[in-house]
């Protein structure tokens, strides 16, 4: 025998108190699949969270973070404070990146500058707290005859044969 509750669509629950008829989810609750025996409480976006998508009878609310914060975790389960570029968030708040490290975003940790010499390259542009170093060509790339790009042949006028 088919379960009568399987006929209850999303947005309803199978109401045992009313002979298993499909009853609408109460306000501030939802059911995203059919055949449910209860609805689920809507997520409430409070405090540092703000509502990105309202709850409906068939889908939960979605939250994001107020300005100055960014989402972390599945479904924006946490909000973490933004820092400025050139900083990272520590237990004591936003701190400048130590010398030799950088962060070009408002989140995440300071990362070490690229070590150009590991690739046999020189530093073309120095790093800052906000930007990584820019590595220049290796000394070998600068030596005469080392260029891998052949210059284009000079253009000839039509009708002239090469001398």
């Amino acid at each position: 025998l088919q379960d009568p509750c399987s006929n209850c669509p999303a947005g309803t629950f199978c109401d045992n108190n009313r002979n298993q008829i499909c009853s609408p989810c109460p306000p501030n609750s939802f059911s995203s699949a059919g055949g449910q025996r209860t609805c689920d409480i809507c997520r409430q976006c409070k405090g540092v969270f703000r509502t990105r998508k309202e709850c409906s009878s068939t889908s939960n609310a979605e939250c994001d973070c107020t300005p100055g914060f960014h989402c972390l975790g599945a479904g924006c389960s946490m909000c973490e404070q933004d820092c400025k570029q050139g900083q990272e968030l520590t237990k004591k708040g936003c701190k400048d990146c130590c010398f030799g490290t950088f962060n070009d975003q408002k989140r995440g940790i300071c990362r070490p500058w690229t070590n150009c010499s590991l690739d046999g390259k020189s530093v073309l542009v120095n790093g800052t707290k906000e930007r990584d170093v820019v590595c220049g060509p290796s000394p070998a790339d600068l030596s005469p005859g080392a260029s891998s790009v052949t210059p284009p042949a000079p253009a000839r006028e039509p009708g002239h044969s090469p001398q």
Partner: nanobody, 122 residues
Framework: EVQLLESGGGLVQPGGSLRLSCAAS????????VGWVRQAPGKGLEWVSA????????YYAESVKGRFTISRDNAKNTLYLQMSSLRAEDTAVYYC???????????????RGQGTQVTVSS
Amino acid sequence: EVQLLESGGGLVQPGGSLRLSCAASGFTVSAEDVGWVRQAPGKGLEWVSAILDKGGSTYYAESVKGRFTISRDNAKNTLYLQMSSLRAEDTAVYYCARIVYHAGGGVTFDTRGQGTQVTVSS
């Protein structure tokens, strides 16, 4: 035992008003989330209005916003629905409902009462 007794329904002309009452026993309306659902002829149940978050907020269906007002009298343990500017499509049996929050996180509701018939017709 939870009991809900609705009253105040009747026949009213379009544009008219009614006030429904729901006398509750077995629980305290001021301490629970309560509201009104209705069932129009040949249709399923529909949420009309509710007092939520122990009175912190109210809910109204789009179709009744600005026309219906939900309230409660804690001393009388009674829930009310003031209905104005009534339309033919408001014709239904109106039930008082108590929203039930289950330990596992689920939500349902109890109606228990027999409901009160509201008919809007000229």
